[in-house]
Protein backbone atom coordinates (compact mmCIF):
# COMPACT_ATOMS: atom_id res chain seq x y z
CA UNK A 1 0.00 0.00 0.00
CA UNK A 2 1.21 3.49 -0.78
CA UNK A 3 1.00 5.59 2.37
CA UNK A 4 1.74 9.30 2.66
CA UNK A 5 0.84 12.32 4.69
CA UNK A 6 -0.68 14.82 2.29
CA UNK A 7 -0.15 18.55 2.33
CA UNK A 8 2.04 18.32 5.40
CA UNK A 9 5.72 19.23 5.38
CA UNK A 10 8.20 17.28 7.47
CA UNK A 11 7.80 20.02 10.09
CA UNK A 12 4.51 21.78 10.79
CA UNK A 13 4.43 24.82 13.07
CA UNK A 14 1.07 25.94 14.43
CA UNK A 15 0.08 28.61 16.92
CA UNK A 16 -1.44 27.51 20.20
CA UNK A 17 -5.26 27.45 20.07
CA UNK A 18 -5.40 26.99 16.29
CA UNK A 19 -6.93 23.94 14.56
CA UNK A 20 -4.85 21.43 12.60
CA UNK A 21 -6.06 18.90 10.06
CA UNK A 22 -3.63 16.22 8.93
CA UNK A 23 -4.52 14.22 5.79
CA UNK A 24 -3.30 10.71 5.13
CA UNK A 25 -3.56 9.17 1.68
CA UNK A 26 -3.70 5.39 1.26
CA UNK A 27 -3.44 3.88 -2.21
CA UNK A 28 -3.57 0.25 -3.32
CA UNK A 29 -5.94 -1.03 -0.62
CA UNK A 30 -9.68 -1.58 -0.91
CA UNK A 31 -10.55 -1.43 2.77
CA UNK A 32 -7.84 0.26 4.83
CA UNK A 33 -8.31 0.80 8.54
CA UNK A 34 -6.32 4.00 8.94
CA UNK A 35 -4.88 4.66 12.39
CA UNK A 36 -3.19 7.82 13.56
CA UNK A 37 -0.19 7.59 15.86
CA UNK A 38 1.45 10.29 17.97
CA UNK A 39 4.87 9.60 19.48
CA UNK A 40 4.17 5.86 19.25
CA UNK A 41 0.68 5.89 20.82
CA UNK A 42 -2.49 5.41 18.80
CA UNK A 43 -4.68 8.54 18.78
CA UNK A 44 -8.31 7.70 19.54
CA UNK A 45 -10.51 10.02 17.50
CA UNK A 46 -13.89 8.45 16.88
CA UNK A 47 -15.46 11.47 15.19
CA UNK A 48 -12.72 11.60 12.53
CA UNK A 49 -13.73 9.76 9.37
CA UNK A 50 -11.98 8.89 6.16
CA UNK A 51 -13.24 9.12 2.61
CA UNK A 52 -12.90 7.06 -0.53
CA UNK A 53 -11.41 8.90 -3.50
CA UNK A 54 -11.72 5.72 -5.55
CA UNK A 55 -12.01 2.01 -4.76
CA UNK A 56 -8.27 1.76 -4.02
CA UNK A 57 -7.57 5.30 -2.85
CA UNK A 58 -8.64 6.60 0.55
CA UNK A 59 -7.94 9.74 2.53
CA UNK A 60 -8.03 9.79 6.34
CA UNK A 61 -8.14 12.92 8.45
CA UNK A 62 -6.88 13.73 11.91
CA UNK A 63 -8.48 16.93 13.16
CA UNK A 64 -7.10 18.68 16.20
CA UNK A 65 -9.61 21.34 17.17
CA UNK A 66 -7.38 23.57 19.27
CA UNK A 67 -3.73 22.64 19.63
CA UNK A 68 -1.81 23.11 22.84
CA UNK A 69 1.74 22.33 23.89
CA UNK A 70 0.87 18.74 24.78
CA UNK A 71 -0.21 18.14 21.15
CA UNK A 72 3.30 18.84 19.89
CA UNK A 73 5.13 15.75 18.69
CA UNK A 74 5.68 13.29 15.87
CA UNK A 75 2.59 12.10 13.99
CA UNK A 76 2.13 9.42 11.37
CA UNK A 77 -0.63 7.28 9.95
CA UNK A 78 -0.53 3.50 9.64
CA UNK A 79 -2.55 0.66 8.11
CA UNK A 80 -2.58 -3.10 8.48
CA UNK A 81 -1.82 -4.83 5.18
CA UNK A 82 -1.47 -8.61 5.00
CA UNK A 83 -0.66 -8.90 8.69
CA UNK A 84 2.02 -6.22 8.48
CA UNK A 85 1.79 -2.63 9.63
CA UNK A 86 2.78 0.01 7.11
CA UNK A 87 3.56 3.48 8.37
CA UNK A 88 3.76 6.83 6.61
CA UNK A 89 6.52 9.37 6.80
CA UNK A 90 6.12 11.31 10.04
CA UNK A 91 5.31 14.98 10.44
CA UNK A 92 6.77 16.93 13.37
CA UNK A 93 4.11 19.19 14.85
CA UNK A 94 5.49 22.20 16.72
CA UNK A 95 3.05 24.27 18.76
CA UNK A 96 4.06 27.89 19.20
CA UNK A 97 2.66 30.14 21.87
CA UNK A 98 3.44 32.69 24.51
CA UNK A 99 6.19 31.53 26.88
CA UNK A 100 5.45 28.71 29.28
CA UNK A 101 6.94 28.88 32.77
CA UNK A 102 8.97 25.89 33.91
CA UNK A 103 10.27 27.69 37.03
CA UNK A 104 8.40 30.48 38.82
CA UNK A 105 9.56 32.59 41.77
CA UNK A 106 8.71 30.96 45.10
CA UNK A 107 7.58 32.57 48.36
CA UNK A 108 10.46 33.14 50.77
CA UNK A 109 11.00 34.20 54.36
CA UNK A 110 14.28 36.03 55.02
CA UNK A 111 15.88 37.96 57.86
CA UNK A 112 15.79 41.76 57.51
CA UNK A 113 18.46 43.05 55.08
CA UNK A 114 19.69 39.53 54.29
CA UNK A 115 20.52 38.78 50.63
CA UNK A 116 18.42 36.21 48.73
CA UNK A 117 17.78 34.90 45.19
CA UNK A 118 14.65 34.30 43.11
CA UNK A 119 14.56 32.13 39.97
CA UNK A 120 12.46 32.29 36.83
CA UNK A 121 12.55 30.16 33.69
CA UNK A 122 10.24 30.05 30.67
CA UNK A 123 10.40 28.26 27.34
CA UNK A 124 8.94 28.64 23.84
CA UNK A 125 8.63 27.80 21.11
CA UNK A 126 9.32 30.21 19.68
CA UNK A 127 12.68 30.96 21.20
CA UNK A 128 14.37 33.08 22.41
CA UNK A 129 12.54 33.85 25.64
CA UNK A 130 13.56 36.88 27.68
CA UNK A 131 12.73 37.58 31.32
CA UNK A 132 11.83 40.87 32.96
CA UNK A 133 11.61 41.11 36.76
CA UNK A 134 9.09 43.19 38.70
CA UNK A 135 9.28 44.33 42.32
CA UNK A 136 5.72 45.22 43.22
CA UNK A 137 4.62 47.48 40.37
CA UNK A 138 8.16 48.55 39.45
CA UNK A 139 10.16 46.93 36.68
CA UNK A 140 13.72 46.13 37.84
CA UNK A 141 16.46 45.89 35.27
CA UNK A 142 16.27 45.17 31.58
CA UNK A 143 15.33 41.94 29.78
CA UNK A 144 17.56 38.95 30.51
CA UNK A 145 17.68 35.61 28.70
CA UNK A 146 15.76 32.74 30.27
CA UNK A 147 16.56 31.24 32.76
CA UNK A 148 17.09 34.23 35.02
CA UNK A 149 18.16 34.57 38.66
CA UNK A 150 17.36 37.78 40.52
CA UNK A 151 19.83 38.66 43.28
CA UNK A 152 18.31 40.90 45.95
CA UNK A 153 20.58 42.51 48.55
CA UNK A 154 17.85 42.56 51.18
CA UNK A 155 14.41 43.86 52.16
CA UNK A 156 13.14 45.63 55.25
CA UNK A 157 9.48 44.78 54.79
CA UNK A 158 7.36 42.13 53.06
CA UNK A 159 7.80 42.61 49.31
CA UNK A 160 6.23 41.05 46.19
CA UNK A 161 8.21 39.92 43.16
CA UNK A 162 7.15 38.48 39.79
CA UNK A 163 8.71 37.84 36.41
CA UNK A 164 7.44 38.35 32.89
CA UNK A 165 8.49 36.18 29.95
CA UNK A 166 8.53 37.54 26.39
CA UNK A 167 8.86 35.90 22.98
CA UNK A 168 7.62 36.65 19.46
CA UNK A 169 4.13 35.39 20.33
CA UNK A 170 3.69 37.70 23.31
CA UNK A 171 4.23 37.73 27.03
CA UNK A 172 3.26 35.65 30.04
CA UNK A 173 3.32 36.69 33.68
CA UNK A 174 4.46 34.40 36.46
CA UNK A 175 2.88 33.93 39.85
CA UNK A 176 3.64 36.63 42.40
CA UNK A 177 6.13 35.55 45.07
CA UNK A 178 5.87 37.18 48.46
CA UNK A 179 9.14 37.64 50.35
CA UNK A 180 8.25 37.80 54.04
CA UNK A 181 10.49 39.17 56.77
CA UNK A 182 11.56 36.70 59.42
CA UNK A 183 11.15 37.72 63.07
CA UNK A 184 11.79 36.40 66.57
CA UNK A 185 9.31 33.70 67.56
CA UNK A 186 6.37 34.34 69.86
CA UNK A 187 6.35 32.94 73.39
CA UNK A 188 5.16 29.36 73.87
CA UNK A 189 1.77 28.76 75.46
CA UNK A 190 -0.35 26.01 77.10
CA UNK A 191 2.59 24.94 79.27
CA UNK A 192 1.60 21.93 81.36
CA UNK A 193 3.36 19.61 83.77
CA UNK A 194 2.07 16.28 82.49
CA UNK A 195 3.72 13.79 84.88
CA UNK A 196 5.09 14.28 88.38
CA UNK A 197 7.11 12.04 90.66
CA UNK A 198 9.26 12.79 93.68
CA UNK A 199 12.33 13.62 91.52
CA UNK A 200 11.10 14.01 87.90
CA UNK A 201 8.62 16.19 86.03
CA UNK A 202 7.47 15.97 82.40
CA UNK A 203 6.64 19.27 80.71
CA UNK A 204 4.79 19.91 77.44
CA UNK A 205 3.94 23.15 75.62
CA UNK A 206 2.61 24.58 72.39
CA UNK A 207 5.00 26.68 70.30
CA UNK A 208 4.03 30.25 69.50
CA UNK A 209 4.31 31.66 65.98
CA UNK A 210 7.72 30.73 64.56
CA UNK A 211 8.42 34.15 63.01
CA UNK A 212 8.63 32.42 59.58
CA UNK A 213 11.91 30.75 60.60
CA UNK A 214 12.18 27.16 61.75
CA UNK A 215 12.19 26.77 65.54
CA UNK A 216 15.50 25.20 66.51
CA UNK A 217 15.27 24.69 70.26
CA UNK A 218 13.37 25.56 73.41
CA UNK A 219 14.76 26.33 76.89
CA UNK A 220 13.01 25.22 80.09
CA UNK A 221 14.15 27.23 83.12
CA UNK A 222 13.34 25.94 86.63
CA UNK A 223 13.55 27.85 89.94
CA UNK A 224 12.43 27.13 93.50
CA UNK A 225 10.47 30.36 93.62
CA UNK A 226 9.29 32.50 90.70
CA UNK A 227 12.19 34.83 89.86
CA UNK A 228 14.45 33.09 92.36
CA UNK A 229 17.77 31.37 91.75
CA UNK A 230 17.87 29.15 88.71
CA UNK A 231 17.96 25.52 89.76
CA UNK A 232 17.95 24.00 86.31
CA UNK A 233 17.95 25.07 82.65
CA UNK A 234 17.35 22.45 79.95
CA UNK A 235 17.76 23.18 76.24
CA UNK A 236 15.80 20.73 74.10
CA UNK A 237 15.76 20.33 70.31
CA UNK A 238 12.25 20.65 68.85
CA UNK A 239 9.92 19.12 67.87
CA UNK A 240 8.57 17.44 69.96
CA UNK A 241 7.71 20.24 72.34
CA UNK A 242 8.31 18.24 75.52
CA UNK A 243 10.99 17.95 78.18
CA UNK A 244 11.79 15.65 81.11
CA UNK A 245 13.18 17.44 84.18
CA UNK A 246 15.29 15.06 86.28
CA UNK A 247 16.98 15.06 89.72
CA UNK A 248 14.46 17.34 91.41
CA UNK A 249 14.11 17.41 95.18
CA UNK A 250 11.04 15.54 96.52
CA UNK A 251 8.17 17.45 98.13
CA UNK A 252 9.46 20.78 96.87
CA UNK A 253 7.73 23.80 95.30
CA UNK A 254 9.18 24.82 91.93
CA UNK A 255 8.30 27.17 89.09
CA UNK A 256 9.23 26.78 85.45
CA UNK A 257 9.03 28.88 82.30
CA UNK A 258 9.77 28.16 78.62
CA UNK A 259 11.07 30.08 75.63
CA UNK A 260 11.86 28.92 72.07
CA UNK A 261 14.40 30.14 69.54
CA UNK A 262 14.72 30.32 65.75
CA UNK A 263 17.74 31.40 63.69
CA UNK A 264 17.12 35.03 64.62
CA UNK A 265 17.08 34.44 68.36
CA UNK A 266 14.87 33.47 71.31
CA UNK A 267 11.26 34.32 72.00
CA UNK A 268 10.17 36.00 75.23
CA UNK A 269 9.70 33.61 78.14
CA UNK A 270 6.18 32.42 78.83
CA UNK A 271 4.67 33.04 82.27
CA UNK A 272 5.91 31.07 85.27
CA UNK A 273 4.10 27.79 85.93
CA UNK A 274 4.26 26.51 89.55
CA UNK A 275 4.44 22.80 90.42
CA UNK A 276 5.38 20.64 93.37
CA UNK A 277 7.28 17.38 93.35
CA UNK A 278 5.85 14.48 95.24
CA UNK A 279 7.34 13.48 98.62
CA UNK A 280 9.03 10.15 99.36
CA UNK A 281 7.09 7.11 100.45
CA UNK A 282 7.99 5.87 103.97
CA UNK A 283 11.31 4.01 104.03
CA UNK A 284 10.71 1.77 107.07
CA UNK A 285 8.39 -1.11 107.83
CA UNK A 286 6.55 -1.38 111.14
CA UNK A 287 8.39 -3.64 113.58
CA UNK A 288 7.33 -6.18 116.20
CA UNK A 289 3.95 -7.06 114.74
CA UNK A 290 2.21 -9.44 117.19
CA UNK A 291 -1.26 -10.74 117.97
CA UNK A 292 -3.34 -11.06 121.14
CA UNK A 293 -6.28 -13.44 121.00
CA UNK A 294 -9.33 -12.30 123.00
CA UNK A 295 -12.86 -13.60 123.47
CA UNK A 296 -14.13 -11.10 120.96
CA UNK A 297 -11.45 -11.78 118.32
CA UNK A 298 -7.84 -10.92 117.59
CA UNK A 299 -5.95 -7.77 118.50
CA UNK A 300 -2.90 -6.89 116.42
CA UNK A 301 -0.20 -4.51 117.68
CA UNK A 302 3.07 -3.10 116.28
CA UNK A 303 5.60 -0.40 116.98
CA UNK A 304 5.09 3.14 115.71
CA UNK A 305 7.24 4.12 112.70
CA UNK A 306 9.21 7.34 113.19
CA UNK A 307 9.95 9.37 109.96
CA UNK A 308 13.58 8.92 108.93
CA UNK A 309 13.66 12.06 106.75
CA UNK A 310 11.61 15.25 106.67
CA UNK A 311 10.80 14.54 102.98
CA UNK A 312 8.67 11.59 104.06
CA UNK A 313 6.29 14.11 105.63
CA UNK A 314 3.80 13.10 108.33
CA UNK A 315 3.24 9.34 108.54
CA UNK A 316 -0.03 7.48 108.93
CA UNK A 317 -2.41 5.86 108.66
CA UNK A 318 -1.27 2.21 108.79
CA UNK A 319 -2.51 -0.37 106.32
CA UNK A 320 -3.13 -3.91 107.48
CA UNK A 321 -3.42 -6.82 105.03
CA UNK A 322 -4.50 -10.33 105.97
CA UNK A 323 -5.13 -13.54 104.08
CA UNK A 324 -6.32 -17.04 104.97
CA UNK A 325 -5.69 -20.25 103.11
CA UNK A 326 -9.38 -20.59 102.31
CA UNK A 327 -8.90 -17.62 100.00
CA UNK A 328 -10.45 -15.01 102.27
CA UNK A 329 -8.50 -11.75 102.33
CA UNK A 330 -9.02 -8.13 103.31
CA UNK A 331 -7.31 -4.81 103.95
CA UNK A 332 -7.83 -2.50 106.86
CA UNK A 333 -6.75 1.10 107.40
CA UNK A 334 -6.11 2.18 111.01
CA UNK A 335 -4.87 5.42 112.55
CA UNK A 336 -2.96 4.01 115.54
CA UNK A 337 -0.66 1.05 116.14
CA UNK A 338 -3.38 -1.34 117.25
CA UNK A 339 -6.15 -3.04 115.29
CA UNK A 340 -9.02 -5.32 116.17
CA UNK A 341 -9.42 -8.01 113.50
CA UNK A 342 -12.88 -9.40 112.84
CA UNK A 343 -14.43 -11.44 110.05
CA UNK A 344 -11.72 -14.08 109.92
CA UNK A 345 -12.09 -17.84 110.40
CA UNK A 346 -10.36 -19.08 113.58
CA UNK A 347 -10.30 -22.60 112.09
CA UNK A 348 -7.91 -21.49 109.33
CA UNK A 349 -4.35 -20.20 109.38
CA UNK A 350 -4.04 -16.41 109.15
CA UNK A 351 -1.16 -14.36 107.66
CA UNK A 352 -1.02 -10.64 108.52
CA UNK A 353 1.23 -7.80 107.27
CA UNK A 354 1.29 -4.07 108.02
CA UNK A 355 2.79 -0.97 106.41
CA UNK A 356 2.75 2.73 107.15
CA UNK A 357 1.56 5.22 104.51
CA UNK A 358 1.89 8.91 103.78
CA UNK A 359 0.67 11.24 101.00
CA UNK A 360 2.88 9.42 98.47
CA UNK A 361 1.94 5.85 99.28
CA UNK A 362 2.64 2.91 101.52
CA UNK A 363 6.10 1.99 102.74
CA UNK A 364 7.53 -1.55 102.81
CA UNK A 365 5.47 -4.33 104.34
CA UNK A 366 6.40 -5.70 107.74
CA UNK A 367 7.53 -9.27 108.21
CA UNK A 368 4.37 -11.40 107.94
CA UNK A 369 2.78 -12.66 111.12
CA UNK A 370 1.34 -16.18 111.02
CA UNK A 371 -1.53 -16.99 113.35
CA UNK A 372 -2.07 -20.74 113.29
CA UNK A 373 -5.56 -22.15 113.68
CA UNK A 374 -4.12 -24.37 116.42
CA UNK A 375 -2.38 -21.48 118.22
CA UNK A 376 -3.89 -19.35 120.88
CA UNK A 377 -1.83 -16.45 119.48
CA UNK A 378 0.79 -15.69 116.85
CA UNK A 379 4.22 -14.16 116.53
CA UNK A 380 6.09 -12.20 113.87
CA UNK A 381 8.31 -14.44 111.77
CA UNK A 382 8.65 -16.21 108.46
CA UNK A 383 5.35 -17.47 106.95
CA UNK A 384 6.12 -21.11 107.86
CA UNK A 385 6.73 -20.41 111.58
CA UNK A 386 4.02 -21.30 114.06
CA UNK A 387 4.36 -20.09 117.62
CA UNK A 388 2.19 -21.13 120.60
CA UNK A 389 1.66 -19.22 123.73
Amino acid sequence: AGLKLMGAPVKLTVSQGQPVKLNCSVEGMEEPDIQWVKDGAVVQNLDQLYIPVSEQHWIGFLSLKSVERSDAGRYWCQVEDGGETEISQPVWLTVEGVPFFTVEPKDLAVPPNAPFQLSCEAVGPPEPVTIVWWRGTTKIGGPAPSPSVLNVTGVTQSTMFSCEAHNLKGLASSRTATVHLQALPAAPFNITVTKLSSSNASVAWMPGADGRALLQSCTVQVTQAPGGWEVLAVVVPVPPFTCLLRDLVPATNYSLRVRCANALGPSPYADWVPFQTKGLAPASAPQNLHAIRTDSGLILEWEEVIPEAPLEGPLGPYKLSWVQDNGTQDELTVEGTRANLTGWDPQKDLIVRVCVSNAVGCGPWSQPLVVSSHDRAGQQGPPHSRTSW
Epitope: M6, D33, Q44, L46, D47, L49, E55, K65, S66
Partner: antibody, heavy 125, light 108 residues
Framework: EVQLVQSGADVKKPGASLTISCQAS????????ISWVRQKPGKGLEWMGQ????????HYGPSFQGHVTISADRSTATAYLQWRSLEASDTAMYYC??????????????????WGPGTLVTVSS | SYELTQPPSVSVSPGQTARITCSGD??????AYWYQQKSGQAPVLVIY???KRISGIPERFSGSSSGTMATLTISGAQVEDEADYYC???????????FGGGTKLTVL
Protein backbone atom coordinates in the same frame (compact mmCIF):
# COMPACT_ATOMS: atom_id res chain seq x y z
CA GLU B 1 -29.84 7.41 -2.88
CA VAL B 2 -28.54 6.21 0.48
CA GLN B 3 -31.05 4.22 2.49
CA LEU B 4 -30.87 2.49 5.86
CA VAL B 5 -33.55 -0.15 6.38
CA GLN B 6 -33.99 -1.39 9.95
CA SER B 7 -35.67 -4.59 11.10
CA GLY B 8 -39.21 -4.40 12.46
CA ALA B 9 -40.44 -3.80 15.99
CA ASP B 10 -40.02 -6.69 18.40
CA VAL B 11 -41.47 -7.74 21.76
CA LYS B 12 -39.39 -10.00 23.98
CA LYS B 13 -39.39 -11.36 27.52
CA PRO B 14 -36.60 -10.53 29.98
CA GLY B 15 -33.66 -12.91 29.58
CA ALA B 16 -34.35 -13.54 25.90
CA SER B 17 -31.75 -12.91 23.21
CA LEU B 18 -32.32 -10.58 20.26
CA THR B 19 -30.54 -9.30 17.18
CA ILE B 20 -31.78 -6.28 15.23
CA SER B 21 -30.40 -5.27 11.85
CA CYS B 22 -29.68 -2.24 9.70
CA GLN B 23 -29.26 -2.84 5.96
CA ALA B 24 -27.60 -0.21 3.83
CA SER B 25 -28.08 0.49 0.17
CA UNK B 26 -26.97 3.13 -2.28
CA UNK B 27 -23.28 3.17 -1.37
CA UNK B 28 -20.25 0.93 -0.95
CA UNK B 29 -20.92 -0.68 2.42
CA UNK B 30 -17.31 -0.69 3.52
CA UNK B 31 -17.17 3.07 3.04
CA UNK B 32 -18.95 3.82 6.28
CA UNK B 33 -18.96 4.10 9.98
CA ILE B 34 -22.23 3.03 11.59
CA SER B 35 -23.27 3.99 15.11
CA TRP B 36 -26.18 2.63 17.13
CA VAL B 37 -28.17 5.12 19.22
CA ARG B 38 -30.76 4.28 21.91
CA GLN B 39 -33.74 6.43 22.85
CA LYS B 40 -35.89 5.27 25.76
CA PRO B 41 -39.55 6.39 25.71
CA GLY B 42 -39.74 10.14 26.42
CA LYS B 43 -35.99 10.34 27.06
CA GLY B 44 -32.84 11.58 25.32
CA LEU B 45 -30.40 10.02 22.88
CA GLU B 46 -27.65 7.66 24.08
CA TRP B 47 -24.65 6.65 21.98
CA MET B 48 -24.19 2.89 22.28
CA GLY B 49 -21.26 2.15 20.01
CA GLN B 50 -19.82 2.23 16.53
CA UNK B 51 -18.48 -0.11 13.87
CA UNK B 52 -16.08 1.05 11.18
CA UNK B 53 -16.52 -0.46 7.73
CA UNK B 54 -12.91 -1.28 6.90
CA UNK B 55 -11.70 -3.99 9.30
CA UNK B 56 -15.04 -3.75 11.21
CA UNK B 57 -13.38 -2.16 14.24
CA UNK B 58 -15.84 -1.60 17.10
CA HIS B 59 -16.06 0.89 19.95
CA TYR B 60 -18.64 0.93 22.75
CA GLY B 61 -19.98 3.48 25.21
CA PRO B 62 -19.12 2.68 28.86
CA SER B 63 -22.78 1.89 29.73
CA PHE B 64 -23.12 -0.61 26.90
CA GLN B 65 -19.74 -2.38 26.93
CA GLY B 66 -20.35 -6.08 27.58
CA HIS B 67 -24.14 -5.79 27.36
CA VAL B 68 -24.48 -5.56 23.57
CA THR B 69 -22.45 -6.67 20.55
CA ILE B 70 -22.14 -4.68 17.33
CA SER B 71 -21.20 -6.58 14.17
CA ALA B 72 -21.50 -6.37 10.39
CA ASP B 73 -21.85 -8.62 7.37
CA ARG B 74 -20.18 -7.02 4.38
CA SER B 75 -21.67 -9.46 1.91
CA THR B 76 -25.20 -8.26 2.72
CA ALA B 77 -24.20 -4.68 3.69
CA THR B 78 -25.90 -5.17 7.05
CA ALA B 79 -24.95 -3.99 10.55
CA TYR B 80 -26.28 -5.78 13.63
CA LEU B 81 -26.97 -5.00 17.28
CA GLN B 82 -27.23 -8.09 19.47
CA TRP B 83 -28.29 -8.85 23.07
CA ARG B 84 -27.67 -12.18 24.78
CA SER B 85 -29.99 -11.46 27.70
CA LEU B 86 -32.52 -8.65 27.50
CA GLU B 87 -33.68 -6.62 30.49
CA ALA B 88 -36.85 -4.55 30.93
CA SER B 89 -34.61 -1.44 30.89
CA ASP B 90 -33.63 -2.25 27.29
CA THR B 91 -37.11 -1.16 26.15
CA ALA B 92 -36.38 1.67 23.68
CA MET B 93 -36.18 2.85 20.09
CA TYR B 94 -32.87 1.90 18.47
CA TYR B 95 -31.51 3.92 15.56
CA CYS B 96 -28.65 3.05 13.26
CA UNK B 97 -26.69 6.03 11.92
CA UNK B 98 -24.32 6.11 8.97
CA UNK B 99 -21.51 8.66 9.12
CA UNK B 100 -19.85 9.74 5.90
CA UNK B 101 -17.34 12.28 4.73
CA UNK B 102 -16.91 12.92 1.05
CA UNK B 103 -15.09 15.44 -1.07
CA UNK B 104 -16.63 17.51 -3.79
CA UNK B 105 -13.69 18.13 -6.06
CA UNK B 106 -11.14 19.14 -3.43
CA UNK B 107 -9.72 17.55 -0.31
CA UNK B 108 -11.90 19.49 2.14
CA UNK B 109 -14.43 16.87 3.27
CA UNK B 110 -18.12 17.53 3.77
CA UNK B 111 -19.88 15.64 6.51
CA UNK B 112 -23.09 13.68 6.04
CA UNK B 113 -25.25 11.50 8.22
CA UNK B 114 -28.12 9.19 7.46
CA TRP B 115 -30.38 7.85 10.18
CA GLY B 116 -32.48 4.72 9.95
CA PRO B 117 -36.18 4.94 10.87
CA GLY B 118 -35.53 3.12 14.15
CA THR B 119 -36.49 -0.25 15.60
CA LEU B 120 -38.76 -0.32 18.65
CA VAL B 121 -37.76 -3.05 21.11
CA THR B 122 -40.14 -3.83 23.97
CA VAL B 123 -38.98 -6.08 26.80
CA SER B 124 -41.81 -7.12 29.08
CA SER B 125 -42.79 -10.18 31.09
CA SER C 1 -17.96 8.62 32.57
CA TYR C 2 -17.92 11.79 30.48
CA GLU C 3 -21.00 14.04 30.45
CA LEU C 4 -22.33 16.91 28.34
CA THR C 5 -24.72 19.26 30.14
CA GLN C 6 -27.60 21.09 28.44
CA PRO C 7 -30.47 23.18 29.86
CA PRO C 8 -33.70 21.13 29.85
CA SER C 9 -35.73 23.83 28.07
CA VAL C 10 -35.47 27.13 26.22
CA SER C 11 -38.41 29.29 25.15
CA VAL C 12 -38.47 32.14 22.60
CA SER C 13 -41.04 34.06 20.62
CA PRO C 14 -41.06 33.69 16.81
CA GLY C 15 -38.37 35.88 15.25
CA GLN C 16 -36.28 36.01 18.44
CA THR C 17 -32.83 34.47 18.80
CA ALA C 18 -32.63 31.14 20.63
CA ARG C 19 -29.37 30.03 22.22
CA ILE C 20 -28.88 26.49 23.46
CA THR C 21 -25.70 25.73 25.40
CA CYS C 22 -23.74 22.53 25.97
CA SER C 23 -20.92 22.28 28.49
CA GLY C 24 -18.29 19.56 28.81
CA ASP C 25 -14.73 19.42 30.12
CA UNK C 26 -13.33 18.08 26.82
CA UNK C 27 -14.97 20.70 24.56
CA UNK C 28 -11.85 22.91 24.40
CA UNK C 29 -10.21 20.01 22.53
CA UNK C 30 -13.14 18.11 21.00
CA UNK C 31 -15.65 19.20 18.37
CA ALA C 32 -19.36 19.58 19.13
CA TYR C 33 -22.17 18.37 16.87
CA TRP C 34 -25.83 19.44 17.08
CA TYR C 35 -28.95 17.40 16.30
CA GLN C 36 -32.57 18.42 15.88
CA GLN C 37 -35.30 15.88 16.70
CA LYS C 38 -38.91 16.73 15.98
CA SER C 39 -41.67 14.81 17.71
CA GLY C 40 -41.98 11.23 16.44
CA GLN C 41 -39.10 11.58 13.96
CA ALA C 42 -35.49 10.44 13.78
CA PRO C 43 -32.87 13.07 14.68
CA VAL C 44 -31.25 15.24 11.99
CA LEU C 45 -27.68 16.57 12.16
CA VAL C 46 -27.65 20.37 11.75
CA ILE C 47 -24.12 21.46 12.82
CA TYR C 48 -20.83 19.53 12.79
CA UNK C 49 -17.32 20.40 13.98
CA UNK C 50 -18.60 23.23 16.22
CA UNK C 51 -19.77 25.61 13.50
CA LYS C 52 -20.09 23.90 10.11
CA ARG C 53 -23.66 23.77 8.85
CA ILE C 54 -24.92 20.63 7.08
CA SER C 55 -26.01 21.39 3.54
CA GLY C 56 -29.76 21.94 3.33
CA ILE C 57 -29.97 23.35 6.86
CA PRO C 58 -31.28 26.97 6.97
CA GLU C 59 -28.72 29.73 7.51
CA ARG C 60 -30.43 30.83 10.71
CA PHE C 61 -28.77 27.83 12.40
CA SER C 62 -25.18 28.49 13.52
CA GLY C 63 -22.77 27.00 16.00
CA SER C 64 -19.90 28.29 18.08
CA SER C 65 -17.57 27.04 20.78
CA SER C 66 -15.50 28.72 23.46
CA GLY C 67 -13.66 26.92 26.21
CA THR C 68 -15.83 24.25 27.78
CA MET C 69 -19.05 25.62 26.23
CA ALA C 70 -20.56 24.99 22.78
CA THR C 71 -23.59 27.00 21.65
CA LEU C 72 -26.26 26.42 19.00
CA THR C 73 -27.82 29.70 17.91
CA ILE C 74 -31.08 29.99 15.95
CA SER C 75 -31.33 33.59 14.73
CA GLY C 76 -34.97 34.48 14.09
CA ALA C 77 -36.48 31.24 15.36
CA GLN C 78 -39.48 29.91 13.44
CA VAL C 79 -42.40 27.87 14.77
CA GLU C 80 -41.14 24.89 12.71
CA ASP C 81 -37.87 24.98 14.72
CA GLU C 82 -39.73 23.75 17.80
CA ALA C 83 -37.99 20.46 18.62
CA ASP C 84 -35.56 18.72 20.96
CA TYR C 85 -31.92 19.66 20.34
CA TYR C 86 -28.99 17.46 21.36
CA CYS C 87 -25.27 18.19 21.45
CA UNK C 88 -22.86 15.37 20.76
CA UNK C 89 -19.10 15.09 21.17
CA UNK C 90 -16.16 12.82 21.86
CA UNK C 91 -15.13 11.77 25.36
CA UNK C 92 -11.96 13.18 26.90
CA UNK C 93 -9.93 10.14 25.81
CA UNK C 94 -11.47 10.14 22.34
CA UNK C 95 -12.61 6.52 22.65
CA UNK C 96 -16.40 6.94 22.82
CA UNK C 97 -19.09 9.45 21.88
CA UNK C 98 -21.59 11.17 24.18
CA PHE C 99 -24.93 12.95 23.73
CA GLY C 100 -26.04 15.80 25.95
CA GLY C 101 -29.30 15.40 27.87
CA GLY C 102 -31.25 17.39 25.28
CA THR C 103 -32.97 20.79 25.30
CA LYS C 104 -36.64 21.27 24.42
CA LEU C 105 -37.00 24.44 22.33
CA THR C 106 -40.43 26.03 22.48
CA VAL C 107 -41.26 28.76 19.94
CA LEU C 108 -44.41 30.40 21.32
Amino acid sequence: EVQLVQSGADVKKPGASLTISCQASGYTFTDYWISWVRQKPGKGLEWMGQIRGPASATHYGPSFQGHVTISADRSTATAYLQWRSLEASDTAMYYCVRHQQQTSGGTIPEYYQHWGPGTLVTVSS
Amino acid sequence: SYELTQPPSVSVSPGQTARITCSGDALPKKYAYWYQQKSGQAPVLVIYEDKKRISGIPERFSGSSSGTMATLTISGAQVEDEADYYCYSTSTGGNYMVFGGGTKLTVL
